[in-house]
Interface confidence: low
């Protein structure tokens, strides 16, 4: 299994109401993707084999798949109370902002420090499940024709 | 214009040693994670290993049949990769090329490679 | 560990639209590239992501990849394309493998 990953969290990200990405420039997103986000969730993964998890979170479109990637990528899920600050999620974060029209105004940033929750985060195997599945939304989103992933 | 350019190769005795150089230029090298593929005299390509780039943790793969054997680095400041080969086997025998990787591991610029011949 | 099988050899017309296929279990799920590499020279990739031409690559030259099987499709083949092809998925465990090889002859 993929060894402990020790990050810092200041600040929680979260999101207001469903966010229609139709209007994305999703060739930029995908370069973004493919030169570096890519690298980033292989990084969190290492050590893990691409068969330990199923995918089971699909979809149908490229702003369906960002959708996806969104909610998997900031929603904090049982099992993996956040990734919103690792590597990966950051750069997600800019390009969604930087390329899909508005988006930065559906985010609110919860400025108060994370007191309550422990400052050293072990990366959990539902977290490790999780970014599989982004994994392959991720692959979806850049291949919606050719890549049933 | 990227540019690789290997250098080191030889002809050197089985369980002997030798030290591959790779300089780089014309891009970003400590960005990049780095290759080295072989090809042995009339045959196909075959992967010897790579380099992930310092900000992914700079970490190493091989392949099994130099696994233990080869070891791979990097000097970013040097813009250069190593592959510094030990307890060599005739079967090791081959252009050495190194390789640049882009999206989906593939590999966008390669050098001209560099021959080593592993014979008594 | 995966496994990519080519077919030794292709031919084809000067003119005519030469096909090197690619196969491997479900390979349609994987990335696949290919390269070019002529004799004495390093290859070159020539289609990365399955159907992605780099820059520089003439658009006679294209890729698709679905089920067991890749293939390289060259339309108006030249004398110059005469080369070995090599393909190479990219798999999330075994991550560079590579095709045994084609040698694209261009007839006439």
């Known amino acids: 299994m993929g060894s402990s990953h020790h990050h810092h969290h200041h600040l929680e990200v979260l999101f207001q109401g469903p966010y229609d990405f139709t209007n994305c420039d999703f060739e930029k997103i995908k370069a973004a993707y493919l030169s570096t986000i890519s690298k980033d969730l292989i990084t969190y993964m290492s050590g893990t084999k691409s068969t330990e998890f199923n995918n089971t979170v699909s979809c149908s479109n490229r702003p369906h798949c960002l959708t996806e990637i969104q909610s998997l990528t900031f929603n904090p899920t049982a099992g993996c109370a956040s990734l919103a600050k690792e590597m990966f999620a950051m750069k997600t974060k800019a390009a969604l902002a930087i390329w899909c029209p508005g988006y930065s105004e559906t985010q609110i940033n919860a400025t108060q420090a994370m007191k309550k929750r422990r400052k050293r985060k072990v990366t959990t195997n539902k977290c490790l499940e999780q970014v599989s599945q982004l994994q392959g939304l991720w692959r979806r989103f850049n291949r919606p024709l050719l890549k049933q992933q | 214009e990227v540019q690789l350019v290997e250098s080191g190769g030889g002809l050197v005795k089985p369980g002997g040693s030798l030290r591959l150089s790779c300089a780089a230029s014309g891009f970003t090298f400590s960005d990049y994670w780095m290759h080295w593929v072989r090809q042995a005299p009339g045959k196909g390509l075959e992967w010897v290993g790579h380099?992930?780039?310092?900000?992914?943790?700079?970490?190493?793969d091989y392949a099994a049949p130099v696994k233990g054997r080869f070891t791979i680095s990097r000097d970013d400041s040097k813009n250069t990769l190593y592959l510094q080969m030990n307890s060599l086997k005739t079967e090791d025998t081959a252009v050495y090329y190194c390789a640049r990787e882009i999206y989906y591991y593939a590999f966008d610029s390669w050098g001209q490679g560099t021959l080593v011949t592993v014979s008594s | 560990s995966y496994e990519l099988t080519q077919p030794l050899s292709v031919s084809v017309a000067l003119g005519q639209t030469a096909r090197i296929t690619c196969s491997g279990d479900n390979i349609g799920s994987k990335y696949v590239h290919w390269y070019q590499q002529k004799p004495g020279q390093a290859p070159v990739l020539v289609i990365y992501g399955d159907n992605e031409r780099p820059s520089g690559i003439p658009e006679r030259f294209s890729g698709s990849n679905s089920g067991n099987t890749a293939t390289l499709t060259i339309s108006r083949a030249q004398a110059g394309d005469e080369a070995d092809y090599y393909c190479q998925a990219a798999d999330w465990v075994d991550f560079y493998v590579f095709g045994g090889g084609t040698k694209l002859t261009v007839l006439g």
């Open positions: 380099i992930k780039s310092k900000t992914d943790a700079g970490t190493t």
